[in-house]
């Protein structure tokens, strides 16, 4: 079951999936001036059996001006930096991707890929949040959101991470705790 909405946006934070549940789709989007090859896939699909999950289909882009197909290569660093949905400013390791059965890793980049990846998540997907540069976590609580099915509709849980700038936190006394990997998770909501 696909999630109806995107994961919630919260102030001064970005999110990333550490692994993608089977059924997740990634649009084959090309950057400006390029398009999908004529017989190319519309999306990549995370599929698998009981022991192994992987991405089906390959995304391929070709110049809008020519008919040449392209090979899979790693983009230049400046291109990678722009992929805001899938890249974060500093590493996050709440989960070892390889240790999650029924999940795919981050797909490798393809040549002339669009700057932002568009994923279509499925129920049960978890994404993790981190404060952007210049902001810090007010508290070390769970920093994730889960797509859940409730009353026949999908919704993402509200992330509990609060990111504040130095000026904002100065008026709040109390010990600052470092942001940690989530232990308690705000996902055990009772379904109907």
């Amino acid at each position: 079951e696909l999630c109806d909405d995107d994961p919630p946006e919260i102030p001064h934070a970005t999110f990333k999936a550490m692994a993608y549940k089977e059924g997740t789709m990634l649009n084959c989007e090309c950057k400006r001036g390029f398009r999908r090859i004529k017989s190319g896939s519309l999306y990549m699909l995370c599929t698998g059996n009981s022991s192994h999950s992987s991405w089906d289909n390959q995304c391929q882009c070709t110049s809008s001006a020519t008919r040449n197909t392209t090979k899979q290569v790693t983009p230049q660093p400046e291109e990678q930096k722009e992929r805001k949905t899938t890249e974060m400013q500093s590493p996050m390791q709440p989960v070892d991707q390889a240790s999650l059965p029924g999940h795919c890793r981050e797909p490798p980049p393809w040549e002339n890929e669009a700057t932002e990846r568009i994923y279509h998540f499925v129920v049960g997907q978890m994404v993790y949040y981190q404060c952007v540069q210049g902001y810090r976590a007010l508290h070390r609580g769970p920093a994730e959101s889960v797509c859940k099915m409730t009353h026949g509709k999908t919704r993402w849980t509200q992330p509990q991470l609060i990111c504040t700038g130095e000026m904002e936190t100065s008026q709040f006394p109390g010990e600052e705790k470092p942001q940690a990997s989530p232990e308690g998770r705000p996902e055990s909501e009772t379904s109907c």
């Epitope: 508290h139 509200q158 509990q160 308690g184 009772t190």
Partner: antibody, heavy 116, light 107 residues
């Protein structure tokens, strides 16, 4: 079903102490911020601050800092709002809500009346 | 703190009317805005979050729009159940703040 149930209405005299409660159910109470909101008679909503029940980390709005105390007991999924010395100006309806950003679930409110 | 100013403070309307309430922030809040409905003697109810996302179970006649520092709540066709007070709340800059409220009353 997610629910926040608050303790009943209170009538107190100035200078008395008071502790009101908010009990959560139907979700992982310890792992969601609880927000406290004040509404004085005939007035709007005021954001008082938040508490994280898992470790009772608290943050107060500057307007309420030093005026009230938040606490929580995660073992019984309950958050508390207390005053050590009530004033007539504390007369209001107090709501607990589930946060931290927007409040998707609210308690029914506790009316606190402070009068000599 | 960011100040939130709603207008009008009171709005008289009839069933079936299209109603618009405005909320202005004292600085840009990047769409981190929620709208609530409150009826007398009841707790507020979340209608809209992230400026335009409709909360589950809220009728589609309610919609939110806006960006930057100016936002609107629109009720496309006012129903008898919609006469209430409406509040906006920003959650962009800690601490969060509410608007003063807009009362929608029967004309």
């Amino acid at each position: 079903e997610v629910q926040l149930v608050q303790s009943g209405a209170e009538v107190k005299k100035p200078g008395e102490s008071l502790k009101i409660s908010c009990k959560g159910s139907g979700y992982s109470f310890a792992n969601y911020w609880i927000v406290w909101v004040r509404q004085m008679p005939g007035k709007g909503l005021e954001w008082m601050g938040i508490i994280y029940p898992d470790d009772s980390e608290t943050r107060y709005s500057p307007s309420f800092q030093g005026q009230v105390t938040f606490s929580a007991d995660k073992s019984i999924s309950t958050a508390y709002l207390q005053w050590s010395s009530l004033k007539a100006s504390d007369t209001a309806m107090y709501y607990c809500t589930r946060g931290p950003y927007y409040s998707d679930y609210w308690g029914q409110g506790t009316l606190v009346t402070v009068s000599s | 703190d960011i100040q939130m100013t709603q207008s009008p403070s009171t709005l008289s309307a009839s069933v079936g009317d299209r109603v618009t309430i405005t909320c202005r922030a004292s600085q840009i809040i990047s769409g981190y805005l929620a709208w609530y409905q409150q009826k007398p003697g009841k707790a507020p109810k979340l209608l809209i979050y992230k400026a335009s996302s409709l909360e589950s179970g809220v009728p589609s006649r309610f919609s939110g729009s806006g960006s930057g520092a100016e936002f609107t709540l629109t009720i496309s066709s006012l129903q008898p159940d919609d006469f209430a007070t409406y509040y906006c709340q920003q959650y962009n800059s800690y601490t969060w703040t509410f608007g003063q409220g807009t009362k929608v009353e029967i004309k």
